[in-house]
């Protein structure tokens, strides 16, 4: 699987999850988030060669098409597969509010 | 929606579904498929600027991060959203077999 366990331990040029730390205030301008100050959102990148973690029959077909037609511009792209939520703390007035934001952290990637 | 209705009628540079005809025999080497000879598989391509059909909170966050950090390599990618099956006819010996292959045709795209 193209997950953090594999990708963070290997120098992988092809589609894999990459570490990306986002600071809420500096990188997003979200000054209202109290905790955490930032988090590892991660991202997916790298080429999708033939059969690399193909998501659907279409991505398999497109990968094969690309192999047999190397000049083609149509190819699968490396995108998030498994995402996890992130729990944040912020204030509504003086009232603390804990909220879980869904799909915030990329744990693995796929070629789609 | 970034679907065939919209994308095929507009000269859209950003993420959209693009027409791609695949000939089973010539482009894939699938000589065994009797009918159809080929089909419009289509594909997704084009940049994913901030908030363009963002798929998840993560892709929204990544798009915003990219806007505020233009030099960053992390950005959402244009990939299939809705896929449709394709019905094919092939022969097992002399027995005709009609089969529906799932997720063969891209109908719309998203930024993921």
């Amino acid at each position: 699987a193209l997950d953090t366990n594999y990708c963070f331990r290997n120098l992988e040029e092809n589609c894999c999850v990459r570490p990306l730390y986002i600071d809420f205030r500096q990188d997003l301008g979200w000054k209202w988030v109290h905790e955490p100050k930032g988090y590892y959102a991660n991202f997916c990148s790298g080429p999708c060669p033939y059969l690399r973690s193909a998501d659907t029959t279409h991505s398999t077909v497109l990968g094969l098409y690309n192999t047999l037609n190397p000049e083609a511009s149509a190819s699968p792209c490396c995108v998030p597969q498994d995402l996890e939520p992130l729990t944040i703390l912020y204030y509504v007035g003086r009232t603390p509010k804990v909220e879980q934001l869904s799909n915030m952290v990329v744990k693995s990637c796929k070629c789609s | 929606a970034l679907d065939t209705n919209y994308c095929f009628r507009n000269l859209e540079e950003n993420c959209c579904v693009r027409p791609l005809y695949i000939d089973f025999r010539q482009d894939l080497g699938w000589k065994w498929v009797h009918e159809p000879k080929g089909y419009y598989a289509n594909f997704c391509s084009g940049p994913c600027p901030y908030l363009r059909s963002a798929d998840t909170t993560h892709s929204t966050v990544l798009g915003l991060y990219n806007t505020l950090n233009p030099e960053a390599s992390a950005s959402p990618c244009c990939v299939p959203q809705d896929l449709e099956p394709l019905t094919i006819l092939y022969y097992v010996g002399r027995t005709p077999k009609v089969e529906q292959l799932s997720n063969m045709v891209v109908k719309s795209c998203k930024c993921s």
Epitope: Y50, L51, T57, T60, V61, L64, T67, L68 | L28, G29, W30, K31, W32, Y90, Y91, V92, G93, R94, T95, K97, E99, L101, S102
Partner: antibody, heavy 121, light 111 residues
Framework: EVQLVQSAAEVKKPGASVKVSCKTS????????MNWVQQAPGKGLDWMGQ????????NYNEMFEGRVTLTVDTSTSTAYMELSSLRAEDAAVYYC??????????????WGQGTLVTAST | DIVLTQTPASLAVSLGQRATISCRAS??????????MHWYQQKSGQPPKLLIY???NLESGVPARFSGSGSRTDFTLTIDPVEADDAATYYC?????????FGAGTKRNDA
């Protein structure tokens, strides 16, 4: 160079299941049908079924009474054959073999080395 | 199912001589202008190896000593001249009808 490398020999009890793998290399895995063939000791060849890796489409020989399941993992270019409810008469060498590519049912141009399955108490 | 009957079941031929193996199908295996009959060689402890496809076409890398002929229900594999390395069991296979079937095999021994 086209290669089909099968998993090691297995000893199973009657009633159990066995899953044999066939790892391929040297060709486009999603372009050709993959066949499975049984050869009982000192006997001839029996075609069990086939799978098309790109779509997962399958065709089975009724002789195996729905006990055979063929699957693939395209990310590793590996085909699998699972035989359930093993009987003593299932003791055999099992081969994966690539179809020639012109038809679904076809001549088989490349074969794995075979996996011996023994069903014994 | 199409039954393929191979004769003889075993064959002893002297080196340098001609060996002929017959395969008879219970019904025609011809369609679309092709004869869907193929021949394989299997040596002891090895997987089968494709020799002849579509009745008469020599598979790449197979010596020209091997040839195939026939149509409809009657097919022949010929080895001429026979060499010591040809000691093996030979199988015919049809794919004109589902299920794909093999003959019972012909074992070639040294005379």
């Amino acid at each position: 160079e086209v290669q089909l490398v099968q998993s090691a020999a297995e000893v199973k009890k009657p009633g159990a299941s066995v899953k044999v793998s066939c790892k391929t290399s040297g060709y486009s895995f999603t372009t050709y049908w993959m066949n499975w063939v049984q050869q009982a000791p000192g006997k001839g060849l029996d075609w069990m079924g086939q799978i098309f890796p790109a779509s997962g489409s399958t065709n089975y020989n009724e002789m195996f009474e729905g006990r055979v399941t063929l699957t693939v993992d395209t990310s590793t270019s590996t085909a699998y054959m699972e035989l359930s409810s093993l009987r003593a008469e299932d003791a055999a060498v099992y081969y994966c073999a690539r179809g020639d590519g012109n038809y679904a049912l076809d001549a088989m141009d490349y074969w794995g080395q075979g996996t011996l399955v023994t069903a014994s108490t | 199912d199409i039954v393929l009957t191979q004769t003889p079941a075993s064959l002893a031929v002297s080196l340098g001589q001609r060996a002929t193996i017959s395969c008879r199908a219970s019904e025609s295996v011809d369609s679309y202008g092709n004869s869907f009959m193929h021949w394989y060689q299997q040596k002891s402890g090895q997987p089968p190896k494709l020799l002849i496809y579509l009745a008469s076409n020599l598979e790449s890398g197979v010596p020209a000593r091997f040839s195939g002929s026939g149509s409809r229900t009657d097919f022949t594999l010929t080895i001429d001249p026979v060499e010591a390395d040809d000691a093996a069991t030979y199988y015919c296979q049809q794919n004109n009808e589902d299920p794909l079937t093999f003959g019972a095999g012909t074992k070639r021994n040294d005379a």
